[in-house]
Interface confidence: medium
């Protein structure tokens, strides 16, 4: 008799999820000498233990605690780059500017980036058919709780000047409902963080507007200022040139505004 399976609204667990997590862990520890001590099998066991046999709408931060301990890592707290709705450019930037870090440049962020996962209550099976959607099904699902946990703690670790890359092409440049807007902004520690500097990335080549005057940016400034953190904002009019100038800062064309 086929067993009844809960149908969720979101896509199922990424194909070859266990193999992918294990392979990423091995690759990360090979590239980062300071993480060579990490036992990737233990990391996978802790990851799996966070969601296997548990109802995928009833996951807690506590479920991920064993994984958090295994992923312990120092981050240069004054070199943190947050991002919202512009992940690819943020990652291209930290690939060039190697001393800056996004969450996905850490072991835990790297392991889970772009993956989906969930289990089923009372069975050891991974659900490859469907997983809960944050809006349509439930917010306490394995993927959402993972990112909320690591994002909160990443923001808590930040100090001095924290940068955030925002997508100037979106209707809401700053979105209160994004991970940045709902989690990271509220977990920056005012006694450690002096300034949040927003980089608003322009989409169109001919777009010369000052997007730092956008109402949603003003809303972000207000939230940050109320938390006793200074706020600054820069327009990045030409993201392609911006990256090129990060690679070659001595280029003569890099003295003009980008």
């Amino acid at each position: 008799v086929p067993r009844w399976r809960q149908q969720w609204s979101g896509p199922g667990t990424t194909k070859r999820f266990p193999e992918t997590v294990l392979a990423r862990c091995v690759k990360y520890t090979e590239i980062h000498p300071e993480m060579r001590h990490v036992d990737c099998q233990s990391v996978w066991d802790a990851f799996k233990g966070a969601f296997i046999s548990k109802h995928p709408c009833n996951i807690t931060e506590e479920d991920y605690q064993p994984l958090m301990k295994l992923g312990t890592q120092t981050v240069p707290c004054n070199k943190i780059l947050l991002w919202s709705r512009i992940k690819d450019l943020a990652h291209q930037f930290t690939q060039v500017q190697r001393d800056m870090f996004t969450l996905e440049d850490t072991l835990l962020g790297y392991l889970a980036d772009d993956l989906t996962w969930c289990g089923e209550f009372n069975t050891s099976k991974i659900n490859y058919q469907s997983c809960p959607d944050w809006r349509k099904d439930c917010s306490n699902n394995p993927v959402s709780v993972f990112w909320k946990t690591v994002s909160r703690r990443f923001a808590e670790a930040a100090c001095d000047v924290v940068h955030v890359m925002l997508n100037g092409s979106r209707s809401k440049i700053f979105d209160k409902n994004s991970t940045f807007g709902s989690v990271e902004v509220h977990n920056l520690q005012p006694e450690k963080v002096q300034t949040l500097e927003a980089w608003v990335i322009h989409g169109g080549r001919e777009d010369s507007r000052d997007l730092c005057q956008d109402p949603t940016i003003k809303e972000l400034e207000s939230i940050i200022s109320k938390r006793n953190i200074q706020f600054s904002c820069k327009n990045i009019y030409r993201p392609d040139k911006f990256l090129q100038c990060v690679k070659n800062p001595e280029d003569s064309s890099c003295t003009s505004e980008i």
Epitope: M68, T74, V75, P76, C77, R153, A157, Q189
Partner: nanobody
Framework: EVQVLESGGGLVQPGGSLRLSCTAS????????MSWVRQAPGKGLKWVSA????????SYADSVKGRFTISRDNSKNTLYLQMNSLRVEDTAVYYC????????????RGQGTLVTVSS
Amino acid sequence: EVQVLESGGGLVQPGGSLRLSCTASGFTFSSYAMSWVRQAPGKGLKWVSAISSSGGSTSYADSVKGRFTISRDNSKNTLYLQMNSLRVEDTAVYYCALGSGSGPFFDNRGQGTLVTVSS
């Protein structure tokens, strides 16, 4: 500016004891959970122990449970780690970190204090 200064490390024989201290400044110490982490020679960073802001809740890595005790004195802005029954494998640089429970991310503020357990 947030600053932490660890002290109390040294050379000790297996089975011996040490008490590490961490003096903090530049932030409201009593508002933050604090942790001890350590880095053995040639190895990565490992979480050791954490304590809540009030000191009412503590947690420990399995490898130190029953031997190490974390505590804090909020009136002195100081975090402590009492280390008993020390083993050779406890040899490491110990750092105190301003952080939420057991990590996973710690900032890189303290210089650390070296604990060497050797006969």
